[in-house]
Interface confidence: low
Amino acid sequence: REAAPKSYAIRDSRQMVWVLSGNSLIAAPLSRSIKPVTLHLIACRDTEFSDKEKGNMVYLGIKGKDLCLFCAEIQGKPTLQLKEKNIMDLYVEKKAQKPFLFFHNKEGSTSVFQSVSYPGWFIATSTTSGQPIFLTKERGITNNTNFYLDSVE
């Protein structure tokens, strides 16, 4: 059977969801006036960078858009960006596309995404509404790095 990405609604502990604003992802409150993105998630077949301690290696995309999350350094700082790319194009590549890869780890009922390119840097939302989704190495009170994934049929 041909592989297909799994679809998830994603929210954090403060009920912030991910919203597409232009070609950026921002965190916004879960509410009727906001249209959150649906996250596409698919496992990477290449095991080159795998580390079971850190979780499963996955590609992350935005459902209905040819946009995928990737990590790049800007002015010396790891940064989360969206790139025009179909998630299935990444999946079919024999070699792992490292900038697009994240370790997906389960912590209780939550999910944590760590950059493969930049170990120790995690996808995060700010506690303030309207801020971009970003990478952080500071896991704690001011940044939310744990997300709830609600399966979408």
């Epitope: 609604a9 502990s13 403060r14 009920q15 912030m16 916004a28 409150p29 879960l30 509410s31 009727r32 006036s33 906001i34 249209k35 959150p36 209780g108 009922s109 939550t110 506690t127 509404s129 709830y148 609600d150 399966s151």
Partner: antibody
Framework: ELQLQESGPGLVKPSETLSLTCTVS??????????WGWIRQPPGKGLEWIGN???????YYNASLKSRVTISVDTSKNQFSLKLSSVTAADTAVYYC??????????????WGQGTLVTVSS | ESVLTQPPSVSGAPGQRVTISCTGS?????????VHWYQQLPGTAPKLLIY???NRPSGVPDRFSGSKSGTSASLAITGLQAEDEADYYC???????????FGGGTKLTVL
């Protein structure tokens, strides 16, 4: 039709643990996108949200009660429960269980139990 | 003191229109979180009256309507009837508290 029924002791001694159970009928407690909550109402006062547990097992608690509250689910009995430790007279209230659904957003508590009065007294 | 502020009481004669306000802040209603309204008749459990700011669950008469603007929300009841005499509560989510919050409640008296 989804129905909820609270049960548990009506009298609890100070410093002890209040334990209540909510039995769900007419639907499954594991249904996707549902959340299950507890709300209380002291005599003659307003409503206070205690906490929720959702279909993923994730819990959300009122910050002012968080250190004393545990909400859990028993899927085999189609029940969810509330435990509130170290109770005082200020915890005397009618306790309601309630449920609602996520549909791209939180839609409020649309089904409620009838409520059960818990008195904290020695 | 409640995070969401409601008037303790409002009153109106049968057939009249009354409104109940619910004032929050930039961390709840003002942060675009939805507002829900509940009606609690004497001696009974609360009942969801309005969800998602302005939506009525099936079975709720169209005499009840909700609206939201800025950091406040309102519940309007037109054609007031004796059976509307009850306590009314607003509810929202507050991200600074990471939890759901209720207003203090408003007692509606039908004169």
């Amino acid at each position: 039709e989804l129905q909820l029924q609270e049960s548990g002791p009506g009298l609890v001694k100070p410093s002890e643990t209040l334990s209540l159970t909510c039995t769900v009928s007419g639907g499954s407690i594991t249904s996707t996108n549902y959340y299950w909550g507890w709300i209380r109402q002291p005599p003659g006062k307003g409503l206070e949200w205690i906490g929720n547990i959702d279909y993923t097992g994730s819990t959300y608690y009122n910050a002012s009660l968080k250190s004393r509250v545990t909400i859990s689910v028993d899927t085999s009995k189609n029940q969810f429960s509330l435990k509130l430790s170290s109770v005082t007279a200020a915890d005397t209230a009618v306790y309601y269980c309630a449920t609602g659904k996520y549909y791209e957003t939180y839609l409020g508590f649309d089904v409620w139990g009838q409520g059960t009065l818990v008195t904290v007294s020695s | 003191e409640s995070v969401l502020t409601q008037p303790p009481s409002v009153s109106g004669a049968p057939g009249q229109r009354v409104t109940i306000s619910c004032t929050g802040s930039s961390s709840n209603i003002g942060a675009h979180y939805d507002v829900h309204w509940y009606q609690q008749l004497p001696g009974t459990a609360p009942k969801l009256l309005i969800y998602g700011n302005d939506n009525r669950p099936s079975g709720v008469p169209d005499r009840f309507s909700g609206s939201k603007s800025g950091t406040s929300a309102s519940l309007a009841i037109t054609g007031l009837q004796a059976e509307d005499e009850a306590d009314y509560y607003c509810q929202s989510y507050d991200y600074s508290l990471s939890g759901y919050v209720f207003g203090g409640g408003t007692k509606l008296t039908v004169l």
